[in-house]
């Protein structure tokens, strides 16, 4: 009966060599995409010149194929019954799943410009970032072609500077050939309750990017969670993209592909400012942009990108206070398209489906010094590019998760 | 207070260098850059270069580049211009002056000036 | 380079009049104009930072205005203590450039 389904299932969802589980853990059997689409601003003289609201008009999707390559220096530790891990980074262009080529050309924020401003306070550096911003003939938006704005190209301005500093600029570079990790998650040996939950990530307990228990890695990384998973439960888990640890609560039941799984969703809340959910106020990191930690929908990762102003949220700034969007036209949130969903199985606690969306944004501030933003009158943060990274269990593995676990529970 | 404190008088052979110093105080070192003028009856005042003494980065005039080098030390808060190759050209008082820092204003507060005399 | 272009050279002012001092530069700097004053042997006295901003505890009879390349340096009613040099700042880009400075002495 039902003791001995638990006790199956709790003996195929431990990560070890022969378990269906470990299998696709190691290399997902689900197939990933991470769709682009990027925020082409039509007005850039009129903002630069007059400070005015940013037009923009998104384009894409443009879509990669990710996650396909297997987990790297997986290492079992038998004493604290955990498993490392190395989760290497990779992307392939699907032309047929895409609007465009990566060659296409998109006016945006010139990324360079924005975070050396923000980077480099003192007037005199800033000053001389100057110089070397004419010089370089670069502006406050530049034109790149898709494949240089996400996985990077040799910056003018940057190329100038007479001291040592990377001179390639990307919003996801380096990317190819470059892991995440390293990982430390149980493996649930000793207690199956902990399965999956990361233990270290790159050999510590906690971030260093936030305070308090906002520094926290809590949870899995969303790619399973402990078995028997109940509607009532807050999931936590850890996402390396934005920095942090966050949780998604139950909203409905769905079919898929004939299994029963429950959606669970990031809540608003998790966005909100600390005015309205408290347990938010580490990470309001800055009183001015935040607006006094008022501000809510837009986290900034700074700490996390070597000091460059990149906020993160939702796309369309989807949750977000009315001041964050309000020097943005052309935006449209709406929760269907733009939040983040998991479909989990409870009984394995796998998630069998899941689209996972998030919105990079760069702050542009005025500066005194520096000709190209001299004219700004106030603070944007400017959206960038949002993706949505989706995966959904193929049809032969359903088939076989309908008859080896639903099929027999029910 | 602010204070910064220049070396003495130099008299210099043509062709000799000569190395000056600023020794600040009542602040805090690393956070301003460091600026030196020099000052002629024909010229006025000119802008030679500046030196950062939290990461010794500088930056110069073009027309001092080759004449001039600075560099600081965050031991003893000081900083130092050395002239190279002088000609009677260089004979001038150099001042050391604060920078802006983060926020402030430019060349708010001055060493009392040293004069260098290029003679044979 | 910005060229910065001080008038006049020295200037004769009865104690209790008007002060005025120019400077042009080539080159739109917005309000990035600083002045100075200097007495003999000793260091320039910033008097008048960017924005037009009198420094504190600098006299209100001394002021600046003007903006993008033409800017006016005035001392109300000239006072003996007054005598000095005075030197005009562009702090808007790289090389900083001075102007050429006016005497101004007591008639």
């Known amino acids: 009966g039902d003791l001995l389904i638990q006790k199956t299932i709790k003996k195929q969802v431990v990560l070890e060599e022969g378990t269906i589980a470990f299998k696709n853990w190691v290399k997902t059997g689900t197939e990933v995409y991470r769709q682009f689409w990027i925020f082409d601003v039509q007005n850039p003289q009129e903002v630069m010149m007059n400070s005015s609201n940013i037009q923009v008009k998104q384009r894409g999707p443009y879509t990669y194929r990710v996650r396909f390559l297997a987990k790297e220096n997986v290492t079992q530790d038998a004493e604290d019954n955990t498993v490392s891990f190395l989760q290497p980074n990779g992307a392939i262009f699907e032309p047929s799943l895409s609007v465009g080529t990566e060659a296409d050309n998109f006016t945006v924020l010139n990324l360079a410009v924005a975070a050396a401003s923000h980077i480099y306070q003192n007037q005199f550096v800033q000053m001389i970032l100057n110089s070397l911003i004419n010089k370089s003939k670069s502006s406050m938006f530049q034109v790149r072609t898709l494949r240089e704005l996400l996985w990077g190209y040799r910056d003018p301005f940057l190329s100038l500077v007479p001291y040592p500093v990377t001179t390639t600029v990307g919003l996801f570079y380096p990317y190819n050939n470059t892991a995440d990790g390293v990982y430390k998650v149980f493996n649930g040996k000793d207690n199956i309750s902990k399965v999956a939950i990361i233990d270290t990530y790159k050999g510590k307990r906690n971030l260093s990017y936030w305070e308090s228990h906002c520094d926290m890695i809590n949870g899995t990384d969303a790619a399973s969670f402990p078995p028997f998973v109940e509607k009532s439960q807050v999931l936590q888990f850890f996402s390396s993209d934005i920095c942090r640890s966050i949780y998604a609560v139950f909203e409905s039941d769905v079919n898929l592909k004939g299994i029963p799984v429950y959606r669970f969703v990031l809540p608003s809340k998790a966005f909100a400012s600390p005015v309205e959910n408290p347990d938010n106020y580490c990470f309001c990191t800055e009183k001015i942009i935040s607006k006094n930690c008022t501000s809510y929908g837009v986290l900034d990762i700074s700490k996390c990108k070597e000091g460059r102003p990149v906020y993160i949220s939702l796309p369309h700034f989807l949750y977000a206070s009315p001041d964050v969007s309000e020097p943005i036209d052309g935006l449209n949130p709406n929760e269907e398209e733009h939040r983040t969903y998991l479909d989990i199985e409870p009984i394995t606690g796998f998630t069998l489906q899941f689209a996972k969306r998030l919105q990079v944004n760069l702050l542009v501030k005025p500066s005194e010094k520096i000709q190209v933003l001299k004219n700004l009158k106030r603070n944007y943060i400017v959206p960038i590019l949002w993706l949505n990274e989706t995966g959904t269990i193929g049809d032969e593995k359903a088939n076989m998760f309908r008859s080896q676990v639903t099929g027999k529970i029910n | 207070q602010v204070q910064l404190q220049q070396s003495g008088a130099e008299l210099v052979r043509p062709g000799a260098s000569v190395t000056l110093s600023c020794k600040a105080s009542?602040?805090?070192?690393?956070?301003?850059?460091m600026h030196w003028v020099k000052q002629t009856p024909v010229h006025g005042l000119e802008w030679i270069g500046t030196?950062?003494?939290?990461?010794?980065?500088?930056a110069f005039n073009q027309k001092f580049k080759d004449k001039a080098s600075l560099t600081a030390d965050k031991s003893s808060s000081t900083v130092y211009m050395e002239l190279r190759s002088l000609t009677s050209e260089d004979s001038a008082v150099y001042y050391c002056?604060?920078?802006?820092?983060?926020?402030?204003?430019?060349?708010?507060?001055w060493g009392q000036g040293t004069l260098v005399t290029v003679s044979a | 380079e910005t060229t910065v272009t001080q008038s006049p050279a020295s200037l004769s002012v009865a104690t209790g009049e008007k002060v005025t001092i120019r400077c042009i530069t080539s080159t739109d700097i917005d309000d990035d104009m600083n002045w100075y004053q200097q007495k003999p042997g000793e260091p320039p006295k910033l008097l008048i930072s960017e924005g037009n901003t009198l420094r504190p505890g600098v006299p209100s009879r001394f002021s600046s205005s003007g903006y993008g390349t033409d800017f006016v340096f005035t001392i109300e009613n000239m006072l003996s203590e007054d005598v000095a040099d005075y030197y005009c700042?562009?702090?808007?880009?790289?090389?900083?450039?001075f102007g050429s400075g006016t005497k101004l002495e007591i008639k």
């Open positions: 700042l562009q702090s808007d880009n790289l090389p900083f450039t």
């Open positions: 009542g602040y805090t070192f690393t956070d301003y850059e």
């Open positions: 030196v950062d003494p939290e990461t010794g980065g500088t």
């Open positions: 002056s604060r920078g802006y820092g983060n926020y402030g204003a430019w060349f708010a507060y």
